[in-house]
Amino acid sequence: APTSSSTKKTQLQLEHLLLDLQMILNGINNYKNPKLTRMLTFKFYMPKKATELKHLQCLEEELKPLEEVLNLAQSKNFHLRPRDLISNINVIVLELKGSETTFMCEYADETATIVEFLNRWITFCQSIISTLT
């Protein structure tokens, strides 16, 4: 059974992941640049189901494409430093989903824009945090 301290750690990690994803989305929403149109043409795979921590495997598999898209946005008004950001997210995701379980991610048929992708994973974090508080 999960201990109080392990639940607290999970909640803190989820809060960090949530903030990181919100920070990316805020950066994109603030981004008034021709590159934004190009960013929105990139397609991301969405999970068929995302209700448990193991489903973060689906997010992990899309982190490299996410970094590539964010690299497009680099400018003096985009402060997210994609390599550091994705590295940080990756560490959190690995800790949250655990490395001992091998979960094969199932993706939905429809792909999504970066904004839809971020909103999906933000909602995932928010719903799990809500069950923990």
Epitope: L12, E15, H16, L19, D20, Q22, M23, L25, N26, H79, L80, R81, D84, L85, S87, N88, I122, Q126, S130, T133
Partner: antibody, heavy 113, light 107 residues
Framework: QVQLVQSGAEVKKPGASVKVSCKAS????????IHWVRQAPGQGLEWMGI????????SYALKFQGRVTMTRDTSTSTVYMELSSLRSEDTAVYYC??????WGQGTLVTVSS | DIQMTQSPSSLSASVGDRVTITCRAS??????LAWYQQKPGKAPKLLIY???SLQSGVPSRFSGSGSGTDFTLTISSLQPEDFATYYC?????????FGQGTRLEIK
Amino acid sequence: QVQLVQSGAEVKKPGASVKVSCKASGYTFTNYYIHWVRQAPGQGLEWMGIINPRAGYTSYALKFQGRVTMTRDTSTSTVYMELSSLRSEDTAVYYCAGGWLDWGQGTLVTVSS
Amino acid sequence: DIQMTQSPSSLSASVGDRVTITCRASQSISSWLAWYQQKPGKAPKLLIYAASSLQSGVPSRFSGSGSGTDFTLTISSLQPEDFATYYCQQSFTMPITFGQGTRLEIK
């Protein structure tokens, strides 16, 4: 216990820059992202932005983008907020907040010619 | 950006009164709402998080309710130390936004 201690009051001329510090103690520095919020005299609270203390990346409110820079020094567990091209409307108390539970005492920045 | 609208903007009440402050979001924020109390010259103090969870150390006379777009902060029996300004805040999405505040004064 958790403490966020901010630098002292500043008086600046229009067009100048100000750098406010926020020193954290009593917890693991990387555990709480730091928000900056300001409050003009007699007014409400206004979110300026956030910094991830582990990796140092930031996200700002659109209103402040291009004028604000948030940085951190992990060796001293200190976060900084620099606001440039100051104008009279920037006269306010500036707060840092860690995880919304713990707040600094506030730093009054007065912009006057 | 999500707009947070508080009402009333000011309120006069007496010690022992039951007081309710409302906060409305311009779009659904689920339960991602917090309430703060601020006294003159002091930093805001977190009272309620996740719309209805009482922050540790906050007296039980404070309670929060609501979800979606409509939220309330209730003080069941006003104490002298409760006269202050109260703010709601959404953290559902960035930019984080606050209500304009409700000033609670002694009648």
